[in-house]
Amino acid sequence: SPSPVTPSPTLKELIEELVNITQNQASLCNGSMVWSVNLTAGMYCAALESLINVSDCSAIQRTQRMLKALCSQKPAAGQISSERSRDTKIEVIQLVKNLLTYVRGVYRHGNFR
């Protein structure tokens, strides 16, 4: 069935939001820990799969919704269920920074998926 009617966030908008929430921040969401994920296995859904479990943190809600919109798109960049590193937990800010680094790389190489 059709995806939701929305101008899906662009990679550039996602990068801007990730920069916005990480700049000058030592921590996010009171240091909450999330499962580390393999961002190469469908980066939007993979990141969302980990971040979906974070609540009571307004700082990342916009990021969560952006990832959800991108993950919901069909054909999607990452409808594939990601493999979570169930033995590795990292801070939310670290995951967000990892995502930012990865997304910037994708953006630079023009592989918007």
Epitope: P4, N53, D56, S58, Q61, Q64, R65, K68, A69
Partner: antibody, heavy 119, light 107 residues
Framework: EVQLVQSGAEVVKPGASVKVSCKTS????????IYWVRQAPGAGLEWIGY????????TYNQNFKDRVTLTADKSTSTAYMELSSLRAGDIAVYYC????????????WGQGTLVTVSS | DIVMTQTPLSLSVSPGETASISCKAS??????LAWFRQKPGQSPQRLIY???NRYPGVPDRFSGSGSGTDFTLRISRVEAEDTGVYYC?????????FGAGTKVELK
């Protein structure tokens, strides 16, 4: 305390439009989206879409394609839902809601606005 | 769209008993599942988010469980005030979708 107060009941003619307002208080309006959900008489809940007052970004349910417009007025902390080309199937209570604790889980709801379509 | 299949559609429970409501999704939701209750003439009320987390003020008689596609809401020691229609909500993907609802009434 988070509060959402909606405009009163509306009776509109088929083919016309309706605009429902949702005035918020008790939190920073631009921090969280406003979601809209409707409920036809005796039926379940149907998600219409949301607007992020921070940047005006919207996501709509495909079922309401081209007929719904969500807007937000930061100066009055009020969100609006306009539905056009109304038909009998649009008779419902329309709710606005916001999500603070868990993203996209509507936890604070307005009292609802009954929209009746009748000639 | 993700389809949420809620069962049963109605449930009659004696006070003090346990009520169980099931919600099955057409695809994995990870942990993006919430529960609401709606009383006649009222707006829906929040109960549980992220499968098993109770909102403040929700009695511990309400518990949520499950993962992936299968989820359950349990109401133990049912009281008169627990009557109403219960809905599940998936918030893993847009559009957000609700179950059809389960009407809980007292015997």
């Amino acid at each position: 305390e988070v509060q959402l107060v909606q405009s009163g009941a509306e009776v509109v003619k088929p083919g016309a439009s309706v605009k429902v307002s949702c005035k918020t208080s008790g939190y920073s309006f631009t921090d969280y989206p406003i979601y809209w959900v409707r409920q036809a008489p005796g039926a379940g809940l149907e998600w219409i879409g949301y607007i992020d007052p921070y940047n005006g970004g919207t996501t709509y349910n495909q079922n309401f394609k081209d007929r719904v417009t969500l807007t937000a007025d930061k100066s009055t902390s009020t969100a609006y839902m306009e539905l056009s080309s109304l038909r009998a199937g649009d008779i419902a209570v329309y709710y606005c809601a916001t999500a603070v604790v868990a993203t996209d889980v509507m936890e604070n709801w307005g009292q609802g606005t009954l929209v009746t379509v009748s000639s | 769209d993700i389809v949420m299949t809620q069962t049963p559609l109605s449930l009659s429970v004696s006070p003090g008993e346990t009520a169980s409501i099931s919600c099955k999704a057409s695809q994995s939701l990870r942990s993006a599942l919430a529960w609401f209750r709606q009383k006649p003439g009222q707006s829906p009320q929040r109960l549980i988010y992220l499968v098993s987390n109770r909102y403040p003020g929700v009695p511990d008689r309400f518990s949520g469980s499950g993962s992936g596609t299968d989820f359950t809401l349990r109401i133990s020691r049912v009281e008169a005030e627990d009557t109403g229609v219960y809905y599940c909500l998936q918030h893993w993907q847009f559009p957000l979708t609700f179950g059809a609802g389960t009407k809980v009434e007292l015997k």
